[in-house]
Interface confidence: medium
């Protein structure tokens, strides 16, 4: 069974997935939908690397920039250097400035709802 | 307005090699992938391969692999498709297409095409 | 790779009658479709995507339709404009591919 068909067969349970079944996804040349991805957990995403999310997604990558303004998209841009979100040649904009530390506070980003950023 | 502007028809000799370009205006380059078609004569469309303009990242039909090289220059917001070891079965009208433009997925947008005759 | 099978292969209408052309792919690929028309001696146009949205400016007869692996695209009442040959495309996974045409001619 290739990634597509089996990414077909585990579609309709993955509204829950945990990061690590995300991660683990990326891996296996799924192509998961947009639509799909939209549906995802927020918590389960915002962990994500830009080359894991490029993976996960294959061609449907490219539609990121339709959804840019939506959750959970907009909330793992935030997450992410702009660096890296330059990478994937989409033109999404709101990730965290080139040489900005990021401290995973975690009480400070579940009372904000944003990563704490230090300055250069 | 989009505009895809391709170089003009080529002819080539079975073994040699074929660059084709393709110059964007009317929206941010960098912010779409650009994909190369191509169409036999008298046949269906095939799609080659992919280009993240960002970062010159490519993805490439398996049949091409080993033959076929997607490029970009940034700066001239020009895409290229050069093939290699070039057989007859090549001879076709090669097209650029960039995908998801205005957030719609499929090809919008096409250049007028590029006729490659590989004779000997 | 993901086979996408056209039918029929040709189709010779009358002004004014509908026409249907049908597409299947070899795997589900949700509705991540698009169909195009190629006039003669043109590039392609873009006329639905996600199999059953219509890109600006394509006339309302033209409706798509199918989730899946089955697809259909639908002219309602065929005009001499129409001509040409239709593709269907996948765009759910690398590579993308596209149909072999259908080639729709006026009566």
């Known amino acids: 069974m290739n990634g597509s068909e089996y990414f077909v067969k585990i579609q309709s349970f993955l509204g829950g997935a945990p990061t690590e079944d995300l991660k683990a996804l990326s891996q296996q040349n799924v192509s998961m939908d947009l639509a799909t991805f939209m549906k995802l957990r927020t918590d389960a995403v915002l962990p994500l690397t830009v080359a894991e999310v490029q993976k996960l997604l294959g061609p449907h990558v490219e539609g990121l920039k339709a959804e840019e303004r939506h959750r959970p998209v907009r909330d793992w841009i935030l997450r992410q250097r702009q660096d890296d979100l330059d990478t994937l040649g989409l033109g999404l904009q709101g990730g965290i400035p080139n040489g900005y530390l990021v401290l995973d506070l975690s009480m400070q980003e579940a009372l904000s709802g944003t990563p704490c950023l230090l300055g250069p | 307005e989009v505009q895809l502007v391709q170089s003009g028809a080529e002819v080539k000799k079975p073994g040699a090699s074929v660059k084709v370009s393709c110059k964007a205006s009317g929206y941010t380059f960098t912010s779409y992938w650009m994909h190369w078609v191509r169409q036999a004569p008298g046949q269906g469309l095939e799609w080659m391969g992919n280009?993240?303009?960002?970062?010159?990242?490519?993805n490439y039909n398996e049949k091409f692999k080993n033959r076929v090289t997607i490029t970009v220059d940034k700066s001239a917001s020009t895409a290229y498709m050069e093939l290699s070891s070039l057989r007859s079965e090549d001879t076709a009208v090669y097209y650029c297409?960039?995908?998801?433009?205005?957030?719609?997925?499929?090809?919008?947008?096409w250049g007028q095409g590029t006729l490659v005759t590989v004779s000997s | 790779d993901i086979v996408m099978t056209q039918t029929p292969l040709s189709l010779s209408v009358t002004p004014g009658q509908p026409a249907s052309i049908s597409c299947k792919a070899s795997?589900?690929?949700?509705?991540?479709i698009a169909w195009y028309l190629q006039k003669p001696g043109q590039s392609p146009q873009a006329l639905i995507y996600s199999a059953s949205y219509r890109y600006s400016g394509v006339p309302d007869r033209f409706s798509g339709s199918g989730s899946g692996t089955d697809f259909t695209l639908k002219i309602s009442r065929v005009e001499a404009e129409d001509v040409g040959v239709y593709y269907c495309q996948q765009y759910n996974s690398y590579p993308l591919t596209f149909g072999g045409g259908t080639k729709v001619e006026i009566k």
């Open positions: 795997q589900n690929v949700g509705t991540n």
């Open positions: 297409a960039p995908h998801y433009i205005g957030s719609r997925p499929g090809f919008a947008y």
């Open positions: 280009v993240n303009p960002s970062n010159a990242g490519s």
